[in-house]
């Protein structure tokens, strides 16, 4: 049985092969149960977490993961050497930097060790699965009386990243959004000196070095301008608090990355 999986990570051509045992027509064998889909994310090209939903198994099962790179010098089958656990059941595998080859087709195979014929294989393009760390060291400088320039740094090869800048004043509910290319610099031509502005930035591994869909976390916000006025009824913290979710939380040692985390690690 050959099933095409449409994954949310840009790997629409990924193919999963389910190997089924033969069975009597009146009963279902355990080996017919589909294995959970594996989701892999490469964090800043420092390490990669491949995770699966272990709770989808009918009974707690320590599934095993093997991987290799298709049509390359790294095509030897490797066993996972660093499992991630959820309630003492394997739910992921962490691969270190030396095991990551972004531009070779990554093949990942999940297997039920109690039913070796029950296995599923996926092929992934890792360059589409990179999530950079949040931009850092946001700085603002005045270019003229009404013009501001925002700069930031990334702990990554800057030319590989595109950026999204959002800003708003204290009176705004919505953000104004501006795409920025690899130059990691943004100018706001007209600033109202009576208002307090908040800026934040996130980055994505796209389009020059890959086609990733997932953005980094938002940077710490940075503020500019007046933070108090008689007319303004709102309360403000003078400085941005420490980032509430650390980068270690986004995929650190022994940390299971859930899809929910990936979609909701954003500050408002």
């Amino acid at each position: 049985l050959n099933t095409t999986i449409l994954t949310p990570n840009g790997n629409e051509d990924a193919t999963t092969d389910f190997f089924l045992t033969s069975m009597p027509t009146d009963s279902l064998s355990v080996s017919t149960l589909p294995l959970p889909e594996v989701q892999c994310f490469v964090f800043n090209v420092e390490y990669m977490n491949c995770t699966w939903n272990s709770s989808s198994e009918p009974q707690p099962t320590n599934l095993t993961l093997h991987y290799w790179y298709k049509n390359s010098d790294n095509d030897k089958v490797q066993k996972c050497s660093h499992y991630l656990f959820s309630e003492e059941i394997t739910s992921g595998c962490q691969l270190q930097k030396k095991e990551i080859h972004l531009y070779q087709t990554f093949v990942v195979q999940l297997q039920d060790p109690r039913e070796p014929r029950r296995q599923a294989t996926q092929m992934l393009k890792l360059q589409n699965l990179v999530i950079p760390w949040a931009p850092e060291n946001l700085t603002l400088r005045k270019l003229s009386e009404s013009q501001l320039e925002l700069n930031w740094n990334n702990r990554f090869l800057n030319h590989c990243l595109e950026h999204l800048v959002q800003y708003r004043t204290d009176w705004d509910h919505s953000w104004t959004e501006q795409s920025v290319d690899y130059r990691h610099k943004f100018s706001l031509p007209s600033v109202d000196g009576q208002k307090r502005y908040t800026f934040r930035v996130r980055s994505r591994f796209n389009p020059l070095c890959g086609s990733a869909q997932h953005w980094s976390e938002w940077s710490h916000p940075i503020h500019w301008g007046s933070n108090s006025s008689k007319e303004n009824p709102f309360l403000f913290a003078l400085e941005a608090e420490q980032k509430l979710i650390s980068e270690e939380d986004l995929g650190g040692e022994q940390k299971l990355i859930s899809e929910e985390d990936l979609h909701h690690h954003h500050h408002h």
């Epitope: 959002q166 204290d170 009176w171 705004d172 509910h173 919505s174 953000w175 104004t176 959004e177 709102f234 309360l235 403000f236 913290a237 941005a240 608090e241 509430l244 979710i245 929910e260 985390d261 979609h263 909701h264 690690h265 954003h266 500050h267 408002h268």
Partner: antibody, heavy 120, light 107 residues
Framework: QVQLVESGGGVVQPGRSLRLSCAAS????????MHWVRQAPGKGLEWVAG????????YYADSVKDRFTISRDNSKNTLFLQMNSLRAEDTAMYYC?????????????WGPGTLVTVSS | DIQLTQSPSFLSASVGDRVTITCWAS??????LAWYQQKPGKAPTLLIY???TLQSGVPSRFSGSGSGTEFTLTISSLQPEDFASYYC?????????FGGGTKVEIK
């Protein structure tokens, strides 16, 4: 999946106080702005108050300013609305709502509501 | 404050009808507008944001348009489950405001 559950509503006399809570689950509460919206019986929706993800900014409708206080406890995934000096016109179903992670930040998830009745 | 005026307040229609609801803003709000649906005894649900962006899971018979001060919500072919109240909301600036609502009833 996102779940918001309001509590603390009830019948209260004019001039008294009430504290509403909204318990959140299924998402990283501490990363999202939250709001209170109310609806008087047979009437439309009225935005009441909002708070940023870290509590650093709070916003109020003119009708409740200086009487209501929005707050949050991110360690307990809970949003609060402290309502003082209640009036008959505060009688309504009170909903808590979560912001969506887009530039426009609409309210993508709502609780089922808790009813507040201000009556002597 | 930005006021939103919705029209009509009530609307009687039949299954299969094309329905249009209008929302006017007292000042320009670009496309900072959302539409919500509310059924009796239930909380509102998000239909459209950014004036025309369909929220995930919302049927394609719903569409939004407009910018500045005039916005419309259109239901191309009214279904039985669409009989409900609809509200616009401006998302531009505080205080946030809702339109007065439009109740869509069965003719």
């Amino acid at each position: 999946q996102v779940q918001l559950v309001e509590s603390g509503g009830g019948v209260v006399q004019p001039g008294r106080s009430l504290r509403l809570s909204c318990a959140a689950s299924g998402f990283n509460f501490r990363n999202f702005g939250m709001h209170w919206v109310r609806q008087a019986p047979g009437k439309g929706l009225e935005w009441v108050a909002g708070i940023l993800y870290d509590g650093s900014s709070k916003y109020y409708a003119d009708s409740v300013k200086d009487r209501f206080t929005i707050s949050r406890d991110n360690s307990k995934n809970t949003l609060f609305l402290q309502m003082n000096s209640l009036r008959a016109e505060d009688t309504a179903m009170y909903y808590c709502a979560k912001e969506e992670d887009t530039a426009m930040v609409p309210f993508d998830s709502w609780g089922p509501g808790t009813l507040v009745t201000v009556s002597s | 404050d930005i006021q939103l005026t919705q029209s009509p307040s009530f609307l009687s229609a039949s299954v299969g009808d094309r329905v249009t609801i209008t929302c006017w803003a007292s000042q320009g709000i670009s496309s900072y507008l959302a539409w919500y649906q509310q059924k009796p005894g239930k909380a509102p649900t998000l239909l459209i944001y950014a004036a025309s962006t369909l929220q995930s899971g919302v049927p394609s018979r719903f569409s939004g348009s407009g910018s500045g001060t005039e916005f419309t919500l259109t239901i191309s072919s009214l279904q039985p489950e669409d009989f409900a109240s609809y509200y616009c909301q401006q998302l531009k600036s505080y205080p946030l405001t809702f339109g007065g609502g439009t109740k869509v009833e069965i003719k």
